[in-house]
Interface confidence: low
């Protein structure tokens, strides 16, 4: 199989003409040393060929994981899940655009891109590396977090004198805390401006606004549709 | 109730040293961050210092680095700050103070303060 | 390290005035910003916390506002007990900064 034929993510696949939004087995690839996995494909947002690695929109799942499931990637692949790191981490060895899509309780919608998206490896605590943001999110709430490690309830690698994760209840790249917590507790409305915990994006809704609907998809930035 | 008792102060001559101690109670104390904030005399707020809640992350004003080292003891519920090679400038009340429960760097409590005088 | 300057250093107002403080980081700063009040021969009280969030117990006569660089916290009727120092503080990052302070007196 050549590097053309090879199939990565769901770009590949788009390439390959699978233009439906859905699930998709990716096959094993023993140069890369990645696993078959099941992904979900967006193929239609601006150009289709995103994979999406985070999902919030039901709250049936708990995202107050340790740091082996945030690894390893949790959830359900049709309602919320976390891909997981190391497969995140793998899918960013190329050049990555990251792309969050979040919703509130008002049928709102926002989003946020950034040019470059790395996730180093799990040595390197999964730090994040990100490119320039541009959207209609408000202020970049990501930045803050920008070459932070990975930190989860029994992995402590924040910039805080406090326990983040323990903290926000979730696992992310937190700093000092946060300027968003997409892996937050999901509060329903009612609930969802009454918590600093809550899948928040402090540059649209502040601090203690938790969002109805959250993706997070990458793909490779020399993308084509 | 949440209650910070700061002890240690006094005077002392320039070049000694000193070690304040804080009495945390009606919290749980091995939850938090907490640090210590001075004020001069008839001056404004200062942060001197801050702790993690395991001791792990330390963080210092640059004006006190290498000189101050701030300690807790959880088992204790006790807050330390030991200063030595002080200067007249360290003149102040020193506060202790609690950070919240939500990671931030700000203090939702403080004790009353205790006041130390470098003079010679 | 961060600046943060307060503006005015001090002010003179009357019961139910509406007063307004400001306060300007060198940097942004987000929403990491804090405002405490401190009356003569106590320690200082927070008031507001991440630029708009009421501290718990705080009358709703103050509020705070702002992002980025530029913050305000607002008194809407100025109460007896308001006479005092207010000392806003940035928490994004360490070393930790207060402002100089703005001393609220009776006219």
């Known amino acids: 199989q050549t590097s053309a034929d090879a199939i990565y993510d769901c770009s590949s696949l788009y390439q390959k003409n699978y233009r439906i939004s859905g699930v998709y087995r990716l096959p094993s690839n023993d140069f890369l040393g990645s696993p078959e996995l099941e992904v979900f494909c967006d193929m239609e947002t601006k150009g289709g060929g995103w994979t999406v690695i985070q999902r919030r929109k039901s709250g049936l799942v708990s995202f107050y994981r340790d740091w082996k499931q945030y690894k390893q990637g949790f959830g359900s692949i049709r309602g919320d899940f976390w891909l997981g790191n190391e497969h995140i981490h793998r899918l960013s060895r190329q050049p990555t655009r990251l792309r969050v899509e979040m919703e509130d309780w008002e049928g709102t919608v926002r989003y946020a891109e950034y040019s470059h998206f790395v996730l180093s490896n799990e040595l390197n605590s999964y730090r994040l590396f990100l490119g320039n943001y541009s959207g209609n999110a408000g202020n970049d709430a990501l930045y803050y977090h920008n070459n932070t490690a990975f930190s989860t309830k029994d992995k402590d690698n924040d910039n805080c004198l406090d326990k983040c994760a323990q903290l926000r209840k979730g696992g992310y790249w937190y700093n000092c805390c946060t300027d968003s917590n997409l892996n937050g507790v999901y509060y329903r409305l009612g609930e969802h401006d009454k918590h600093l915990d809550g899948i928040t994006w402090y540059g649209w809704h502040g601090a203690n606004y938790s969002l109805k609907r959250v993706e997070m998809k990458i793909r490779p930035e020399d993308f084509k549709p | 109730e949440v209650q910070l008792v700061e002890s240690g102060g006094g005077l002392v001559q320039p070049g000694r040293s000193l070690r304040l101690s804080c009495a945390a109670s009606?919290?749980?104390?091995?939850?938090?961050?907490m640090h210590w904030v001075r004020q001069g005399p008839g001056k404004g707020l200062e942060w001197v210092s801050g702790?993690?809640?395991?001791?792990?992350?330390?963080g210092y004003a640059d004006s006190v680095k290498g000189r101050f080292t701030i300690s807790r003891d959880n088992a204790k519920n006790s807050l330390y700050l030991q200063m030595n090679s002080l200067r007249a400038e360290d003149t102040a009340l020193y506060y202790c103070?609690?950070?919240?429960?939500?990671?931030?760097?700000?203090?939702?409590?403080w004790g009353q303060g205790t006041l130390v005088t470098v003079s010679s | 390290d961060i600046q943060m300057t307060q503006s005015p250093s001090s002010l003179s107002a009357s019961v139910g005035d509406r007063v307004t403080i400001t306060c300007r980081a060198s940097?942004?700063?987000?929403?990491?910003l804090n405002w405490y009040q401190q009356k003569p021969g106590t320690a200082p009280k927070l008031l507001i916390y991440?630029?708009?969030s009421l501290q718990s117990g705080v009358p709703s006569r103050f509020s705070g506002s702002g992002s980025g660089t530029d913050f305000t916290l607002t008194i809407s009727s100025l109460q007896p007990e308001d006479f005092a120092a207010y000392y806003c503080?940035?928490?994004?990052?360490?070393?930790?900064?207060f402002g100089g302070g703005t001393k609220v007196e009776i006219k």
């Open positions: 940097q942004s700063i987000s929403i990491y």
């Open positions: 702790i993690g809640w395991n001791s792990g992350s330390i």
């Open positions: 103070a609690k950070a919240p429960d939500y990671g931030d760097y700000y203090f939702d409590y």
């Open positions: 503080q940035q928490s994004y990052t360490t070393p930790l900064t």
């Open positions: 991440a630029a708009s």
């Open positions: 009606g919290f749980t104390f091995d939850d938090f961050a």
